[in-house]
């Protein structure tokens, strides 16, 4: 059927980069600039993608495929292909409707995008709070209370990363 | 084609004032969200302001109260009406298109203006 269909259409002939043209007895012309075509046989080039604004160009079009975008500094790629750009906000925030806001108590933001997020409950697992938690990170779960009885073997946890209660820089 | 034309942009010293316009034409301008962003020199770009169709108005922390975001759909234009400027707000202000309706977030789809350049100095 393959070998059929490529006799009886000679658009099928036409390779990625160019397309079948139709004002001009089905010939394969070069896709214009500022378009593309990623597979063979196409009647049409698509549009390049531009990245404006807030989008900047990863890669750029071609003759057989579209542009890329991703985000200026202080913005990060949401949805598939970096469709959208959204601002950064500092770690300890999070992005509202108002802006970039403080993570309320008891929740925390490690990263500059995102949502605060609940500190671990470590009573839920029989644990203690070894390390208080802040907006930038996590509380730090202990052995359980049972465990630092006396006689019990002590635990050496591993030293936190930077003092609790101070922001990053 | 869409088109949107800033313009007002200028030299200012601090506390002054300054009235930005963008021009817009090619869409359907009484329906759509429109925002400003900036970008200072040698920094990213900002989120400034954002403003519904309806006339909901948005605004980045550092410039609420000091700024106001507002349209004319009869005249396709959108303002941005800036007081008690400071030398933090020399930047380079766009108008763009704003669909997503979220704050500090853009789509692919959405239009940016050339931009205007202000410059706060004494």
């Known amino acids: 059927f393959e070998r059929t269909r490529s006799l009886q259409d000679p658009c099928s002939n036409c390779p990625a980069g160019t397309f079948c043209d139709n004002n001009r007895n089905q010939i394969c012309s070069p896709c214009p600039p500022n378009s593309f075509s990623s597979a063979g046989g196409q009647r049409t080039c698509d549009i390049c993608r531009q990245c404006k604004g807030v989008f900047r160009t990863r890669k750029e079009c071609s003759s057989t495929s579209n542009a890329e975008c991703d985000c200026t500094p202080g913005f990060h790629c949401l949805g598939a292909g970096c469709s959208m750009c959204e601002q950064d906000c500092k770690q300890g925030q999070e992005l509202t409707k108002k802006g970039c806001k403080d993570c309320c108590f008891g929740t925390f933001n490690d990263q500059k995008r995102g949502i605060c997020r609940p500190w671990t409950n470590c009573s839920l697992d029989g644990k203690s709070v070894l390390v208080n938690g802040t907006k930038e990170r996590d509380v730090v779960c202990g052995p359980s209370p049972a465990d630092l009885s006396p006689g019990a073997s002590s635990v050496t946890p591993p030293a936190p990363a930077r003092e609790p209660g101070h922001s990053p820089q | 084609q869409v088109q949107l034309v800033e313009s007002g942009g200028g030299l200012v010293k601090p506390g002054g004032s300054l009235r930005l316009s963008c021009a817009a034409s090619g869409f359907t301008f009484s329906s759509s969200a429109m925002s400003w962003a900036r970008q200072a020199p040698g920094k990213g770009f900002e989120w400034v302001s954002g403003?519904?169709?309806?006339?909901?108005?948005y605004y980045t922390e550092s410039v609420k109260d000091r700024f106001t975001i507002s349209r004319d759909n009869a005249k396709n234009s959108l303002y941005l009406q800036m007081n008690s400027l400071r030398p933090e707000d020399t930047a380079v202000y766009y108008c763009?298109?704003?669909?997503?309706?979220?704050?500090?977030?853009?789509?692919?789809?959405?239009?940016w203006g050339q931009g205007t350049q202000v410059t706060v100095s004494s």
């Open positions: 763009a298109t704003w669909g997503t309706l979220r704050f500090g977030v853009w789509a692919e789809y959405d239009h």
């Open positions: 403003i519904y169709s309806g006339g909901s108005t």
